[in-house]
């Protein structure tokens, strides 16, 4: 058993049929010594008496808010949550496996630049009685500070018969050095509580590996005289790290016909312009990637040819 926050405790349980559970000692936070009784949740049924109470915790019916009383007055509360371990593996019932980039990916994180700011998100089908708390650091043995905000519901989607809820959180490394080579990874820890179930999820990464630039901005077409060719130009996204001479991007320019089956013409360039043939009813799209490190490509920025 360990304390999650004041008066909230997590009991770690091996979860199998007829498991003996854990013995937990509760102490009433009071100078009183006598006449103390204990109840569980809203029940008026008395569980036991005394300043300390030893309880066996082996099912969700044993979790909940234990309250000590004296003469009808509430003295203190202790909320017990359960963390299940089945076959040596902690339960992951609350969050959905996103399966990208690999199985058992519950947290996904992205950064728009090297400033030390990043966003993580996760999915669940649970809509109520759900709380999240996020902590982060650079390294784990001698951790350096990363400050995370509150997790918020950022999207709702319908998937077949189920509703899916996306939560996200923004974090900022306290003393980020954008140009430095990373040697210790960022660690992100999410505590999830659904009703009386506790779970925790972690992710470990280098900022360089989660970089995904915003799409190029101000995408424009300039027709070339007496030609089917056009000059496409764009700019670095505002959110990308500066100076651009050091934090450089490379770009992919694509000409895509109306039909998805039509052949795509692609050009790769380090410049912020390119000359392409603009076919009727086609569109031109440009995306960006860190020039010197193969992290994710940005989403496409697009304009129609006409």
């Amino acid at each position: 058993i360990w304390e999650l926050k004041k008066d909230v405790y997590v009991v770690e349980l091996d979860w199998y049929p007829d498991a003996p559970g854990e013995m937990v000692v509760l102490t009433c936070d009071t100078p009183e010594e006598d006449g103390i009784t204990w109840t569980l949740d809203q029940s008026s049924e008395v569980l036991g008496s005394g300043k300390t109470l030893t309880i066996q915790v082996k099912e969700f019916g044993d979790a909940g808010q234990y309250t000590c009383h004296k003469g009808g007055e509430v003295l203190s509360h202790s909320l017990l949550l359960l963390h299940k371990k089945e076959d040596g593996i902690w339960s992951t019932d609350i969050l959905k496996d996103q399966k990208e980039p690999k199985n058992k990916t519950f947290l996904r994180c992205e950064a728009k630049n090297y400033s030390g700011r990043f966003t993580c998100w996760w999915l669940t089908t649970i809509s109520t009685d759900l709380t999240f708390s996020v902590k982060s650091s650079r390294g784990s043995s001698d951790p350096q500070g990363v400050t995370c905000g509150a997790a918020t519901l950022s999207a709702e989607r319908v998937r077949g018969d189920n509703k899916e809820y996306e939560y996200s959180v923004e974090c900022q490394e306290d003393s980020a050095c954008p140009a430095a080579e990373e040697s210790l990874p960022i660690e992100v820890m999410v505590d999830a509580v659904h009703k009386l179930k506790y779970e925790n999820y972690t992710s470990s990464f280098f900022i360089r590996d989660i970089i995904k630039p915003d799409p190029p901005k101000n995408l424009q077409l300039k027709p070339l005289k007496n030609s089917r060719q056009v000059e496409v130009s764009w700019e670095y996204p505002d959110t990308w790290s500066t100076p651009h001479s050091y934090f450089s991007l490379t770009f992919c320019v694509q000409v895509q016909g109306k039909s998805k089956r039509e052949k795509k013409d692609r050009v790769f360039t380090d410049k912020t312009s390119a000359t392409v043939i603009c076919r009727k009813n086609a569109s031109i799209s440009v995306r960006a990637q860190d020039r010197y490190y193969s992290s994710s490509w940005s989403e496409w920025a697009s304009v129609p040819c006409s």
């Epitope: 559970g21 009784t37 049924e45 008395v46 569980l47 309880i55 066996q56 915790v57 082996k58 099912e59 019916g61 044993d62």
Partner: nanobody, 115 residues
Framework: EVQLVESGGGLVQPGGSLRLSCAAS????????MYWFRQAPGKGHEWVST????????AYADFVKGRFTISRDNAKNTLYLQMNSLKPEDTALYYC????????RGQGTQVTVSS
């Protein structure tokens, strides 16, 4: 008729063991929280242990300190209290009850711990 009958008490030396039984009739113990209490000579009654419904999770008074184990046999409709490492201060009348107030309780069984 709702009834609780305790048995298994007796005289035992310090460090010894006893197993108390509480046979219930007229109701099912598996559907109720069940309690053991005790009353020492010249003292008030004292809660010892509770067993809950469902998986039968348990609770114990501080003085028990791992020495006693409450259990039940649903098929026999009987509640038990296994008492090990007994001390002279465990000498008391032990009784089972269906509720905290003791509105349904047995007559008790005497446990005496003495050398």
């Amino acid at each position: 008729e709702v009834q609780l009958v305790e048995s298994g008490g007796g005289l035992v030396q310090p460090g010894g063991s006893l197993r108390l039984s509480c046979a219930a009739s007229g109701f099912s113990i598996s559907n109720n929280w069940m309690y053991w209490f005790r009353q020492a000579p010249g003292k008030g009654h004292e809660w010892v242990s509770t067993i809950k419904t469902g998986a039968g999770s348990t609770a114990y008074a501080d003085f028990v300190k791992g020495r006693f184990t409450i259990s039940r046999d649903n098929a026999k409709n009987t509640l038990y209290l296994q008492m090990n490492s007994l001390k002279p201060e465990d000498t008391a009348l032990y009784y089972c009850a269906r509720d905290w107030a003791g509105t349904v309780r047995g007559q008790g069984t005497q446990v005496t711990v003495s050398s």
